[in-house]
Every structure is written in C-alpha cells, then in structure tokens.
C-alpha cells in the first residue's frame, strides 16, 4: 500500500506552503519591527511565561488531545503543530494590520505574540471536527480563513460593542466550535465500508489524548487570565479556573461512570469533560467574586459534557459526519454558550447593584456580541467549507480518512503501528 | 501616601527627542497600570498611552503612535515616556496618572502635578 | 477616533442642582466604557472624582454622584457649593485596548 501523498498534492502542498511563508517572510520585512523600548527583565520573563503556556497547550494539549484515533495519531499531533506555526504567523500581521497599522508598521510584542497564540488556537479547536478528512493544503486554507475571520470578529465586536481583549478573545469557544462544525458539515460525510475501524480510538493514542487533556488541564488558568489588564483580575481569573476545572474532572469521571449501564468510564467522555469547567467560566472568571460559585459552574460544565457527549456524538455524526472520538466541536459550543450566559447574568447582577440604568441595553449588547460571533463562525466555516470542497485541493478519499499512511512515511508500513 | 513626580520636561527644538519619567512611590508600582495624559494651554485633557502592570502591553493615541514610546521599570517604581520627532502641537504639561482595573472597574485614581514640554524653535 | 463630548459650559447657583452630560460618537454609553469623572481647578492636576459610572473615591464629597442617562454618561452635583466651581471631564474607554478618551471638559460657573 503506497504511502505518498497522490502526486498532484505532492506539487501543491509544498508549492503553496512555501509560497505563503515566503510572502508572509516579505510582510514580516516591510511591515513589522520589534518593540524597541527597555524592559524591567523581571516583568519580561513573566510575560513570556504566560505566552510560553499558551504554546504548551496548543501544541501539547491541543495537538494530542486530537491524537485518539487508532491509525491518525501521527497527523493529529504534527498537523496542529503545523497549523499553530502558520496560524501564529499571520495572526501576528492580521492584529497589526487591523490594530496599529496608521503608524505604519506592526509593533511586535510579547503580548501580540500572546494575542497570535490565541487566535491561532481557535484553529486547533475547530479543526478537531475534520481532521482525518482533510489534507495539509486544506488545512492551510482553514488557517488563512479562521485567524482572519476570527481577527475581523475580534475588531468588529472591539469596536461596535467596545469590548476589551479578555471578553474579545472569549469568544474563541463559541466561534470556533461553531467555524468546525460548519466546515465539517460541508466535507463529504458517509465512510465507506471496511473503513469504520479507522475513526475508533485505540489505547496508546487514547493515552496520548489523556496527555493532551493534562497539559490542557493545566494551563487552562493560563488561557483564562492572559488577557486581563490587571494582576487583581489575572488572580480571580486563575483562581476561579482552577476551581472550575478541578470541579469538572470529579464531575467527569463519576457523571461518566453514572451514564454507562455497567458503571463504566468511558476515556472519550474524560478527554473533554475534563476541561469542561474552564470553557464554562472563560467569560466571566474575572467577574466571579468567590470559590463556590467557580465550582457550581464546573459542576453543571462536567455534567453538560457528559451528557453531550453521551447523546449528541450519534446525531452529529449522521448530520455532520464527525467521528465519536471528536466531541470538541459540540462540546465548546455547548459550554461557550454556558459561558456567555453566566457573563449576562453576571452583568445584570453588577448593573443592577451599580444602580444604573440600562440594563435591558447591556443585555441586549452582549446577546448581539454573541449572535455576531456565531453568524460570523458559521458563514466563514461554510466559505472555508466550500472552499475545501474544490477539486484543486485533491482531498483525500474518503476510503483513505483517518489514515496516517496517506500522509507520512513509515518504514514497516504496518497496520498496527 | 500615593505619590506620582514627572520630571524631564522642558523646551526643545521640533524633531528633537525628549523623554520624560515618571517616580512613583507610596504603592506598589508593579501592581498597577499607568497612563500619561496631556494638556495643552488652556486646552483639555488628552489621552496619550497606557502601559500594563507588567509592561506587557501598550497602547498609544492615534496622533503619537511611531513616535512616542511608553515603558516602565517596576525595578525602580519609574515610568517613562521616551517622545521622538516632536512637533509644535505636542506642546502641554504632561500628567502621569495611576490605573485600578478589577473586574468590571477602571479608574485614572491618582495624578502627578505634572511636567511641562514646550517645543519650539 | 471616538469623540467625546461634553457641554462646553454650565451655569448654577448655589445650593442648586447641576447635571453634566458625557456622550460617545460611536452611540449610546455603557457601563464597559467605564466612565470617569474628573475635576480641575486652573493651575491645578485634575482630581478623580467617579469611576466605573457611579463608584465614588475616598475623597469624593457626598454631593457629587455619578449615574447613565438617556444613553450619556452623567454627573450630578446636588447642593452645588461655591469650591465646586471648576472644569469637569469625563473619561471613557473604548475597543479592545481600552484607550481612553476625554471630553472637551465643562466649565461650571456658580454664580
């Protein structure tokens, strides 16, 4: 069975690849150059930490959490790492561009590397509705489309709604899961026979994607307060996160155990719920004011994942052909929905006991913040869909889904591996 | 008490450089965000930059973005504000001011006396 | 570039009640553009006065109090005194950045 690419993407892929990262090396030339002033070197290995975080959950957590598939472990985990590269790349110019550009050049910071980081990260989320059905030249595509579209959402909701990074960058959740799930529905769906056993997790991936949990796990805090202006509100974040996903990893393990008929804990079910709580409170963890009410919303986060990944894999992989092991995409929706109603209540508790007015218009602002992103998320993800669906791409077949031989070079070429 | 001097101010030649600092001290210096706004004669206040607690982000007014720089050094409580190709118009006494943000708050609470620049040929 | 503004001037007496009004180009004010409220008497720095629309400071005379109206930001003066005769701005944060903006100031006048 032949390893190679077909040869018409073995002339696309590099071709287009190398183009783009020229182009982006001349951007990077004309338009960009580093912030020239003095720092406290303190304050600076401090602020590359939080960056160094976001970079271990992206290409750690979120490159093997997508890793359980039997025979696709291998382009899970090098596939999100190529993405983040890309990702972060043009990410960098797109904010610059959008942010800074009437002073002529793009100021490169520690915290715009950050901001690129994040951005860079909704592909990664997203992604999980279609890997193993796409190749790498798709994929480049679904990196161009998203960090723009998800940088014009970001400006757009900056602007109209005068939001700050931290609830701008929030949206990440709800926009992502629902660019992935729109993308997905456009791919071809049905796999043929013989090839069932590809989409099934296997035990050494399914490990890999326990990893890919932990780091994930970990960080989360760090996601959460990135983007916070101040160490009061970096504190309450990271502490309410913490709270949440610790909450969400009980709640996981036994919700599972409760939902199968022989008590049984299902390892798919644990990959997301774990993160369930972070999800649940990335809008509002600055706004939470104490422990417990972090820990409620992990509580019904966990629960929330549990059932939607016990009752919701089955209608999406017959509406929108994702495999089982996939339940990203439906579970960040849920959850970023979760997330954004607990920051509306939360508002309107803080509105009302301010005593302003108003409170109808605030509500109503954060209802459009949230209806924009998630129409700008579905028509981009059916552009980047339709876009995937071109003949040009030479997409893999869907007998070859989930299939790492398709992709990469094995010396033994054995099934099992 | 919380205490903010600006000093470096002074009269300089248009394209020329200036820059000016900022002391702070009656509070920890590394736990705030910090803001330099301007006034020109008889004029109103102008927003000019703000700088993170930790100096991770700042961010400038349209009219000083390229040319003026705003940095901190939590080392020493001081503030700065590093401003090249200076022009007639920026010509004010420029106020350095003390940032609270938490949560759903944000306040300019404590401000220097003030330094005045006067660019002039 | 937003634009905020302010009346540009104000006439009270003594004893009375005074409203200052704060409004956005870019339509109606909320409480996430933070408004702060601020007093100069000449010569002098400014003073905080209200923050985050209605938190007072410390040092804030109970007098002044800060509230949304009619989609402004607003200050209320009530049993104005003749030391309140200054020039008030207001402040409001915008975008993603949150860069601040100011009002072309009030100049309030007790007569």
């Known amino acids: 069975m032949s390893s190679k690419y077909p040869r018409s993407v073995r002339r696309c892929l590099p071709l287009w690849a190398l183009t783009l990262e020229a182009a982006l090396i001349l951007l990077f030339y004309f338009f960009t150059h580093y912030d020239a002033s003095l720092e406290d070197q303190k304050g600076l290995v401090a602020s590359y930490q939080v960056g160094q975080d976001l970079t271990v959950m992206a290409a750690i957590g979120l490159g093997f959490l997508t890793s359980s598939f039997r025979r696709h472990s291998w382009s899970s985990v090098a596939f999100n790492l190529f993405m983040l590269a890309l990702g972060v790349q043009w990410a960098i110019l797109l904010d610059g561009f959008l942010s800074q550009f009437p002073s002529g050049k793009v100021v490169i910071t520690l915290f715009s590397i950050r901001l690129a980081t994040m951005s860079a990260l909704s592909v990664l989320i997203s992604v999980d509705a279609v890997l193993g059905k796409v190749n790498l030249a798709q994929l480049v595509v679904m990196v161009l489309v998203e960090v723009t579209a998800l940088g014009n959402l970001r400006m757009v909701i900056s602007n109209i709604f005068n939001t700050d990074y931290h609830m701008n960058m929030m949206h990440i959740y709800v926009f992502a899961a629902y660019f992935g799930l729109s993308v997905a529905w456009c791919l071809p769906k049905p796999l043929p026979e013989g090839t069932e056993d590809k989409d099934q997790t296997a035990t050494i991936p399914s490990l890999s994607a326990m990893l890919g949990a932990l780091f994930l796990w970990m960080f989360w805090p760090s996601f959460n307060s990135a983007l916070l202006r101040s160490p009061i509100e970096r504190k309450n974040a990271v502490f309410n996160t913490y709270y949440a996903v610790a909450v969400s990893v009980v709640t996981a393990i036994s919700g599972s155990s409760l939902a199968h008929p022989q008590g049984k804990i299902s390892k798919t079910y644990v990959h997301s719920a774990v993160l369930a709580g972070g999800v649940a409170v990335g809008t509002s963890c600055h706004l939470i004011p104490s422990p417990w009410l972090a820990m409620v919303l992990g509580l019904v986060a966990g629960l929330i994942s549990v059932g939607g990944a016990k009752y919701l894999p089955g209608c999406c992989n017959r509406v929108l052909g994702i495999p089982h092991s996939s339940i990203m995409g439906y579970n960040f929706s849920l959850l970023g929905l979760l997330g954004e109603i607990i920051y509306i209540v939360l508002l309107v508790l803080d509105t009302v006991g301010a005593g302003n007015g108003m409170i109808g218009f605030q509500v109503l602002l954060s209802i459009g913040e949230l209806s924009l992103a998630i129409v700008i998320a579905l028509m981009s993800g059916l552009l980047t869909g339709l876009l995937l669906n071109l003949k040009i791409w030479k997409a893999p077949h869907e007998a070859k889904y989930f299939d790492d031989q398709v992709f990469w070079k094995f010396p033994h070429l054995a099934v099992g591996f | 008490e919380v205490q903010l001097v600006e000093s470096g101010g002074g009269v300089v030649q248009p394209g020329r450089s200036l820059r000016l600092s900022c002391a702070a001290s009656g509070f920890t210096f590394s736990s705030y965000g910090m803001h330099w706004v301007r006034q020109a004669p008889g004029k109103g206040l102008e927003w000019v930059a703000v700088?993170?607690?930790?100096?991770?982000?700042?961010d400038y007014v349209d009219s000083v973005k390229g040319r003026f720089t705003i940095s901190r050094d939590n080392s020493k409580n001081t503030l700065y504000l590093q401003m090249n190709s200076l022009r007639a118009e920026d010509t004010a006494v420029y106020y350095c001011?003390?940032?609270?943000?938490?949560?759903?708050?944000?306040?300019?609470?404590?401000w220097g006396q003030g330094t005045l620049v006067t660019v002039s040929s | 570039q937003a634009v905020v503004t302010q009346e540009p001037s104000l006439t009270v007496s003594p004893g009375g009640t005074v409203t200052l009004t704060c409004a956005s180009s870019t339509g109606a004010v909320t409480t996430g553009y933070y408004p702060n409220w601020f007093q100069q008497k000449p010569g002098q720095a400014p003073r905080a006065l209200v923050h985050?629309?209605?938190k007072k400071h410390s040092w804030t005379p109970a007098r002044f109090s800060g509230s949304l109206l009619g989609g402004k930001a607003a200050l209320t003066l009530s049993g104005v005194q003749p030391e309140d005769e200054a020039e008030y701005y207001c402040?409001?944060?915008?975008?993603?950045?949150?860069?601040?903006?100011f009002g072309g100031g009030t100049k309030l006048t007790v007569l």
């Open positions: 985050s629309t209605s």
């Open positions: 001011a003390r940032e609270l943000a938490k949560g759903r708050l944000r306040d300019l609470d404590h």
């Open positions: 700088i993170w607690y930790d100096g991770s982000n700042k």
């Open positions: 402040l409001l944060f915008y975008g993603g950045a949150q860069l601040g903006v």
